[in-house]
């Protein structure tokens, strides 16, 4: 096991998972650490305990490993992080990885007021529903933004939009969770659609919704921006 | 569906040798991932040893040069050789499997198993 010591020198790895950071109950995810060639051993670390190991052999590319967890729950839903050795030396740690289990006990309802079609620069609102009583609601635009927004909410939690643009065009699915990383069945998806004439830019707002002080959970994994929420609803999408 | 069956278990004298094994039904045996863990009267199960599919191994720092994991896959079966055995090794010993996993993945973590046996009691009395 990986000791703490001055000789931390060299530079952190990278880590990311594929087909998703969020995972479905019961299926399973890879996680990927890129170190150096000259690795010879990768370590895991769940929540800040030792989870798993991977010693890369010479005739394989040794600058990153597999690690691979066969059945997603919400004991192995969290904050993992990496670190590989070369020599007597240990990396730093990579940046943390967010992983997210979903399909937990219920699934929400989600709506859209007024309605689902709405015109350029209307008030339009996101409600999301969920019987079982949670701590927090997260909104998900499929194929958006490497944002998620949250609410706190006990059954029921609402999302402003403010003034739509053709930015908010798109499918929307919410999430009830349990904790951060233990997260309800999606709801069943609410396309937005945006109708009217050229768009005026004043109306644009700096991010994809007039409050920035809804998008705070950050899915973006690591510096090289490996990591993206293209594939939320399709697991087969990434290889 | 894997099932693990442990034997082996018993007891013996410090100093005194035993060797542990998991018998895993399936055809998947080759393609998993094993490990042992134990868990003492009142303590929590810790992580023993493991044993990836290509047959690399990682042990706890209490029983490194003292015990070590093995398998068979034509015998669908991994063993734990116990030996130079102390008090503090008395616990119920569990077999557990990762299925399927990858490459030269060794699992120390538990809940990263997803197949546990029933378990085996390992008692070192004078």
């Known amino acids: 096991q990986r000791i703490n010591t001055e000789k931390e020198t060299l530079p952190k790895p990278i880590i990311w998972a594929k087909p998703s950071i969020m995972v479905t109950n019961g299926n399973s995810v890879n996680i990927w650490c890129q170190g150096a060639q000259s690795a010879s051993e990768y370590q895991l670390y769940f929540e800040g305990s030792f989870f798993a190991l991977e010693r890369p052999k010479p005739s394989r590319s040794m600058n990153k490993v597999r690690f691979f967890i066969s059945q997603m729950t919400s004991h192995t839903a969290g904050i993992y992080t990496c670190f590989y050795q070369s020599g007597e030396l240990w990396s730093k740690s990579s940046n943390p990885l967010k992983l997210v289990v979903t399909g937990l006990y219920d699934t929400p309802n989600l709506w859209v007021y007024p309605r689902p079609e709405v015109t350029l620069g209307e008030n339009v609102t996101f409600f999301c529903q969920l019987k079982t009583a949670t701590s927090k609601f997260f909104l998900l635009k499929e194929r958006g933004s490497n944002h998620i927004q949250n609410k706190y909410g006990n059954i029921q939690a609402e999302f402003p939009m403010g003034p739509v643009t053709r930015a908010h065009r798109g499918t929307y699915r919410c999430f009830g969770s349990y904790n951060d990383y233990a997260w309800s069945f999606p709801s069943e998806p609410v396309t937005l659609l945006i109708t009217g004439g050229v768009e005026n830019s004043s109306l644009a707002p700096t991010d994809p919704t007039s409050s920035l002080d809804y998008w705070e959970f950050d899915l973006s994994t690591n510096e090289s921006g490996l990591q993206k929420d293209s594939a939320f609803w399709d697991h087969t999408t990434q290889n | 569906e894997v099932q693990l069956v442990e034997s082996g278990g018993g007891e013996v004298q410090p100093g005194g040798s035993l060797r542990l094994s998991c018998a895993a039904s399936?055809?998947?045996?080759?393609?998993?991932?094993m490990g042992w863990f134990r868990q003492a009267p009142g303590k929590e199960r810790e992580f023993v040893a493991a044993?990836?599919?290509?047959?690399?191994?990682y042990y706890a720092d209490s029983v490194k040069g003292r015990f070590t994991i093995s398998r068979d896959n034509a015998k669908n079966t991994v063993y734990l050789q116990m030996s130079s055995l102390r008090a503090e090794d008395t616990a119920v010993y569990y077999c557990?499997?990762?299925?399927?996993?990858?490459?030269?993945?060794?699992?120390?973590?538990?809940?990263?198993?997803?197949?546990w046996g029933q378990g085996t009691l390992v008692t070192v009395k004078p």
């Open positions: 557990a499997a990762v299925v399927p996993t990858y490459g030269s993945n060794i699992y120390v973590y538990s809940a990263a198993y997803n197949y």
């Open positions: 399936g055809r998947t045996f080759a393609s998993a991932a």
């Open positions: 044993i990836s599919r290509s047959d690399d191994t």
